[in-house]
């Protein structure tokens, strides 16, 4: 009897036309939610002029519909068993999930500002910048809706900037009609173990991001894993919206819908300092922020984001050291609500329930020749917004599951 | 190879005028801010005044508002700085300057010796 179930999850879970694990891959069945959590500055002037502590309010959630648009340029490759892919971007604002309406108004960092005196550091190009920044009647801060700070707006001080220069700055800008990719995984044909694993991403085998290991695609996308998964397994997966792989380690089990599965968790280790995880060495790029990379629960992605300085973290800096939040007022960070997790149902290794949570933060410095930076005194990693975004098997499909899956087993 | 060329210093009275010129080659001026710093002896350079590229934004150093004026051609390649009202403290070695995103830190010209006094 588990010979022949054997066998039918192995036939089932390969991607290909015709299984079920391919038609739930192609276009998910579970709808996917991303909510939004914005970090309102408090004392905006406080700071720029006294370089006190940010005092942060979160707001939120603002919540949309994301992962509905099916997979593009599915492309089959028989000789080494592949398909590779695009996964298609896009957003649709959901009100009644939400407290509030993409016109809210936020007081935020201004990314601009951050990101062009970090970028530029020579002081006679700083004191250009400075002018247009005046010019521009720009400051540290800024004033934005949501729909900007999430999806572009065209900045006034960018905008004086001479050519090449975007001018258009948002968060997730570019976002909707832009696609994730090209992702290339094996399906599984020739070998089970090895289905959803990502062979290429953009066509290469290494982000070009970080050094040695830490620079490598590992795993799968998460949605997925290979089938037949064991509580003793570290589960590698890459997540592009953090420019790393990563992985998660089993926690508990649940029981979802009926349905028995292993709820797997992305470690404090995971986050931790080269001192504590000599494995993480290659996470740390450089020696001042970093205070010789002592810190830890911030990830410096500045490298994957064209040199603007973005640090990725746990939410309210959950797992991050205290020096990083110190800076910070407002902030609680708990495991329950801010930590990421995957439930994975073992035999198949489909990921029915997920909640994937990360922090997007700036890291602003004093500058001598900026006006608006000329008072600090200190480094700030300052939190802009963190995501939830969340993905649960939906009723129909659980009964489908129990019945066709679990059911049959047990 | 990038060359900024500036001309028009030279000794002026207090009160008196002088216009600054810099030419420029082997870059695609239309698309570079173009600015005027200045060096007096012993002290830190200092920007004087700025041209952007597109639409011409100018902007300029408190000290001298009022009484500078930038300009730019870009079809001869040229930005010029009017200097009226000149004070003895305008004295400095003035210097060109082309910049724009693509660089880390700008282009110089070699600079031009601007003295006023009686």
């Known amino acids: 009897g588990d010979l022949l179930i054997q066998k039918t999850i192995k036939k089932q879970v390969v991607l290909e036309e015709g299984t079920i694990a391919f038609k739930n891959w192609v276009k998910t069945g579970t709808e996917v939610y991303r909510q939004f959590w914005i970090f309102d500055v408090q004392n905006p002037q406080e700071v720029m002029m006294n370089s006190s502590n940010i005092q942060v309010k979160q707001r939120g959630p603002y919540t949309y519909r994301v992962r509905f648009l099916a997979k593009e340029n599915v492309t089959q490759d028989a000789e080494d068993n592949t398909v590779s892919f695009l996964q298609p971007n896009g957003a649709i604002f959901e009100p009644s999930l939400s407290v509030g309406t993409e016109a809210d108004n936020f007081t935020v960092l201004n990314l601009a500002v951050a990101a062009a005196s970090h970028i530029y550091q020579n002081q006679f190009v700083q004191m250009i910048l400075n002018s247009l920044i005046n010019k521009s009647k720009s400051s540290m801060f800024q004033v934005r809706t949501l729909r900007e700070l999430l999806w572009g707006y065209r900045d006034p001080f960018l905008s004086l900037v001479p050519y090449p220069v975007t001018t258009t700055v948002g968060l997730f800008y570019p976002y909707n009609n832009t696609a994730d990719g090209v992702y290339k995984v094996f399906n599984g044909k020739d070998n089970i173990s090895k289905v959803a694993i990502i062979d290429t991403y953009k066509g290469k085998r290494n982000l070009s991001y970080w050094e040695s290991h830490c620079d490598m695609i590992n795993g799968t996308d998460a949605a997925s894993f290979p089938p037949f998964v064991e509580k003793s397994q570290v589960l590698q997966f890459f997540s592009s919206d953090i420019c790393r792989s990563i992985y998660a380690v089993f926690e508990s089990d649940v029981n979802l819908k009926g349905i028995p599965v292993y709820r797997f968790v992305l470690p404090s280790k995971a986050f931790a300092s080269p001192v504590e995880n000599p494995d993480n060495y290659c996470f740390c790029t450089e020696k001042i922020i970093s205070k010789n990379c002592t810190s830890y629960g911030v990830l410096d992605i500045s490298k994957c984001k064209e040199g603007r300085p973005v640090y990725i973290s746990l939410p309210h800096f959950l797992y991050a050291s205290p020096d990083v939040s110190e800076p910070i007022d407002g902030l609680n960070p708990n495991e329950e609500e801010h930590r990421t997790y995957l439930d994975i149902e073992p035999i198949t290794g489909f990921t029915l329930q997920f909640a994937k949570r990360l922090q997007v933060n700036l890291l602003v410095k004093p500058s001598e020749k900026i006006q608006v930076l000329k008072n600090l005194k200190r480094n700030y990693i300052v939190p802009i917004l963190w995501l939830n975004e969340t993905g649960t098997i939906g009723d129909e499909k659980a009964n489908m599951f129990r019945s066709q899956v679990t059911g049959k087993i047990n | 190879q990038v060359q900024l060329q500036e001309s028009g210093g030279g000794l002026v009275q207090p009160g008196g005028s002088l216009r600054l010129s810099c030419a420029a080659s082997g870059l695609a001026f239309s698309t570079y801010a173009m600015s005027w710093y200045r060096q007096a002896p012993g002290k830190e350079r200092e920007l004087v005044a700025l041209?952007?590229?597109?639409?011409?934004?100018?902007d300029y150093a408190d000290s001298v508002k009022g009484r500078f004026t930038i300009s730019r051609d870009d079809a001869e390649k040229t930005v010029s700085l009017q200097m009226n009202s000149l004070k003895p403290e305008d004295t400095a070695v003035y210097y060109c300057?082309?910049?724009?995103?693509?660089?880390?830190?700008?282009?110089w010209g070699q600079g031009t010796q601007v003295t006023v006094s009686s």
């Open positions: 300057s082309a910049w724009r995103a693509t660089l880390f830190k700008p282009y």
């Open positions: 041209i952007t590229s597109a639409g011409g934004t100018t």
